[in-house]
Structures are given as C-alpha cells and as structure tokens.
Interface confidence: medium
C-alpha cells in the first residue's frame, strides 16, 4: 500500500525531518507549513491548526519560504547619487547602486550604502588605476616626456609630440609646442580615455499596485566630498 500523505500539521516520525516548505514548530511539536515569499506567519500553528500566513505590507518583504512573524523592512529609498537597480516589492529588497562617475565607498550586503564621486586627476597627473564600482581612481604624476592637461577621472598621461624644432618644451601638464614645421611624430590628438566602470543594471518593472503597507528604516550616511589625494581634485 502507498504511504499516506500527511497534511500539515502532523507529528513527524521519530528521527525524521519535516518536508520541503515545512518547519518543525517546537511549541506544537508538529510539522507545519512555511509561508511563501511575500508572506509572513500571522498565526503560528498548533496541534490542530496550520500556520496562518498573511501578505507583507508596504515597504516590507520576505524573499524565502519562512515562518517569521513580521516581514523585513526594505532599505531606504535610494539617494540622488544612486540608481535603484532593484525595486522594493513584497518578495525582494530594494538595491541601490552608484550612478556613473561615482563608486561605492561603503557597501552593504546588497548594493551600496554610501557612494562617493570618482577622484579627478588634475593637470600634470594621469589615471594610474581606473575607478571601479567599489574603488576610487588612483592618480600618478606624469613621467618626463608625458603630460595630462585635463582634470579627469579617465585620462591617462600621454606622450609629448616630437618636434623637428621645439617652440615650447612640454611639461607634465602641457604638450610640447612645435614650430610651424610639422612634427616628425605626434600622438593622436584626442585625450586617451580609460573605460568607465560599467554597472550591470537590470531594468526592474514594478508590479501593479496591490493593497499594501510599511517604510524603510535603514539609514543613509551623510555624503561628504572624498578627501582629495595628491594630484586629484574633489570636483
């Protein structure tokens, strides 16, 4: 004969565990139903009645099958130096990431708590290491024979043009100026750019509004300018 399917709540066989999407309630000493993502346990099970689940209220969520008494609060609304890459819904937390030109100075489990603008290297300095989603730009002085005349978070030092006859010698922040006869060799005229860090941004479509309820409680840290390093500007 096939084994009978037990309906929750039920007492598990000694030494056995509850099935998938069930949990063992210590008080009732029964296997009881978990609540689905987007819900929480409104009433815990007893020996004779199963878990009563209720939908998460506005600004709260549960991502997993659970038996928590309250849904989790979504994180704060994203700040203006961030973009919302995942919205707060019944089943997921809000994720805020830094917008282009910024990096995450203080991360959290998912997304970023504090964004800061990428350092800009001032004239005479070029980018030694480009910024990423989680690290700032590193600037270095332009070596002899190279220059950077921009204030930029992407431009590297580039070689001076080589002249037949030099009118004005180049320095760390200025290219060489040749006399009217053309230079024997010149670099491409445009500045050399390093690629900006690219964040992967999934477009999240929010679901149709439903009866709802609750706000975000996680804190935002004050945004101050990052201290300029040597050869950088806080601009």
């Amino acid at each position: 004969l096939p084994a009978q399917v037990a309906f929750t709540p039920y007492a598990p066989e000694p030494g056995s565990t509850c099935r998938l999407r069930e949990y063992y309630d210590q008080t009732a000493q029964m296997c009881c139903s978990k609540c689905s993502p987007g819900q929480h346990a409104k009433v815990f099970c007893t020996k004779t009645s199963d878990t009563v689940c209720d939908s998460c209220e506005d600004s709260t969520y549960t991502q997993l099958w659970n038996w928590v008494p309250e849904c989790l609060s979504c994180g704060s609304r994203c700040s203006s130096d961030q973009v919302e890459t995942q919205a707060c819904t019944r089943e997921q937390n809000r994720i805020c990431t830094c917008r282009p030109g910024w990096y995450c100075a203080l991360s959290k489990q998912e997304g970023c708590r504090l964004c800061a603008p990428l350092r800009k290297c001032r004239p005479g300095f070029g980018v030694a290491r480009p910024g990423t989603e989680t690290s700032d730009v590193v600037c270095k002085p332009c070596a002899p024979g190279t220059f950077s005349n921009t204030t930029s978070s992407t431009d590297i030092c580039r070689p001076h043009q080589i002249c037949n006859v030099v009118a004005i010698p180049g320095n760390a922040s200025m290219d060489a100026v040749c006399t009217s006869t053309s230079p024997t060799r010149s670099m491409a005229p445009g500045a050399v750019h390093l690629p900006q860090p690219v964040s992967t941004r999934s477009q999240h479509t929010q679901p149709t509004p439903e009866p709802s309820t609750a706000p975000s409680t996680s804190f935002l840290l004050p945004m101050g300018p990052s201290p300029p390093a040597e050869g950088s500007t806080g601009d």
Epitope: E57, D58, S59, T60, S73, C74, S76, R77, C78, S79, S80, D81, Q82, V83, E84, A87, C88, T89, R90, R94, C96, R99, Q206, P209, S212, T213, A214, P215, S216, T217, L220, M223
Partner: antibody
Framework: DVQLQESGPGLVKPSQSLSLTCSVT?????????WNWIRQFPGNKLEWMGY???????NYNPSLKNRISITRDTSENQFFLKLNSVTTEDTATYYC????????????WGQGTTLTVSS | QAVVTQESALTTSPGETVTLTCRSS?????????ANWVQEKPDHLFTGLIG???NRAPGVPARFSGSVIGDKAALTITGAQTEDEAIYFC?????????FGGGTKLTVLG
C-alpha cells in the same frame, strides 16, 4: 477606508511652539507606510516637512531640521508635528498624508488644518 | 536645496492628450527621484495619482500615466475630461527629503 484627520490650535503667537495631531483610521501607523506632514502656504506652494516610519524613525526637511519633531502615539494611532520658534512665515494649511515604499505615492491626505501665526 | 519647476498653467480640451512636466534644478530626473504626482481640487482636496515615476495609485483612472521624458518627469493625461481641471503638483525625492514643484493649473475648456 483609510482616513487622516488633522487637528490643531488655529492660532499661535510668534516664537511659540506649534503642535498638531494627525488621527488615522483604517490603517495602523505601525503596520507600515511613511506618515508625512506637508504644508501649503498662501499662494498654493507645498512644502514637505518630514515623516515618521512604522518603527518610529524620522526623516525631516533639511530646512526645518533644527525646529521640527514628529512623534507618534501607537495606542491612539496618532502622529504629531511639533514646530518650534514659529514666525509669521509658518502661516499655512498643514496636512498629514501617507506614502508608501513600494510605489511611493501620497495615496491618502487629510483635509488640512489652517494655522495662523500672529501676535 | 533643489528647486523643482513645473509649467504654471496649461489649457486643454476634453478628449485631448496633455503632458505636464517636472524639472529638477540638479540635473536630469531619474527613477531614483521617485517622481510623484498629486492632484489638488477646490477646497484643498488632494489625491495622489502617480508615485515612483510611473505607478498609478489605486482607483486612479488609466488615462493618467507617469514617465520620464528626456531629463524631466512627466504626467500625461490621455483623453482629458472636464473633471481633470485642477492643480497638479509633482514631488521629487532627493536622497532623504521630498521637494514639491510650484504646481501646474490645468484648465479643461468645456
């Protein structure tokens, strides 16, 4: 149905403190949402003042930060606005409103209470 | 503090489509500004229409829609009706506070 109702003194003297109450029915202030105070000056300009969340934490308009306080009484399902050192510039109609963290709309508003600051 | 700018007045006719916009002094409006649209009718009756740029509040007719057009938030009324005559305020979220625009007085010529 959710209803919000403001109440307050109507007239306050300059330099005094203003205290307003928002009574909420049909929705528990601990179950969620952001519970806001918004004012409308003569001439229709709206100013967001601040909110209190379901766990009692606050966010205030930076321009009011040193004189505003929003608190609540969960047993009465009410939340309160206190504004210190008022001037005639604080003469306005004061509204309480609810907004949510999923969809961010101010879905319910009170009828407003008019406050005049005058000696 | 940021300044939010709206058209002071617009006029439309019943059945026409009209778009109200909301500009931020700090640059382009993004989804992280959670653009909010509120309608004020006579006797200070406020109704929330749109939140989070494009989420319609429950009970709001489908002719109201929110979006970002270029660098501004926009409220579009497709097939305006005489009862849509009102003042429309937008609000934008800046890191930790809302800022309201000055409002657009919409007249629907009957």
């Amino acid at each position: 149905d959710v209803q919000l109702q403001e109440s307050g003194p109507g007239l306050v003297k300059p330099s005094q403190s203003l205290s307003l109450t928002c009574s909420v029915t049909g929705s528990s202030i601990t179950s969620g949402y952001y519970w806001n105070w918004i004012r409308q000056f003569p001439g229709n300009k709206l100013e967001w003042m601040g909110y209190i969340t379901n766990d009692g934490s606050n966010n205030y308009n930076p321009s009011l930060k040193n004189r505003i306080s929003i608190t609540r009484d969960t047993s009465e399902n009410q939340f309160f606005l206190k504004l210190n050192s008022v001037t005639t510039e604080d003469t306005a109609t004061y509204y309480c409103a609810r907004d949510g963290g999923w969809f961010h709309y101010f879905d319910y508003w009170g009828q407003g209470t008019t406050l005049t600051v005058s000696s | 503090q940021a300044v939010v700018t709206q058209e002071s007045a617009l006029t439309t006719s019943p059945g026409e489509t009209v778009t109200l916009t909301c500009r931020s002094s700090t640059g382009a409006v993004t989804t992280s500004n959670y653009a909010n649209w509120v309608q004020e009718k006579p006797d200070h009756l406020f109704t929330g229409l749109i939140g989070g740029t494009n989420n319609r509040a429950p009970g709001v007719p489908a002719r109201f829609s929110g979006s970002v057009i270029g660098d501004k938030a926009a409220l579009t009324i497709t097939g305006a009706q005489t009862e849509d005559e009102a003042i429309y305020f937008c609000a934008l979220w800046y890191s930790n506070h809302w800022v309201f625009g000055g409002g657009t007085k919409l007249t629907v010529l009957g």
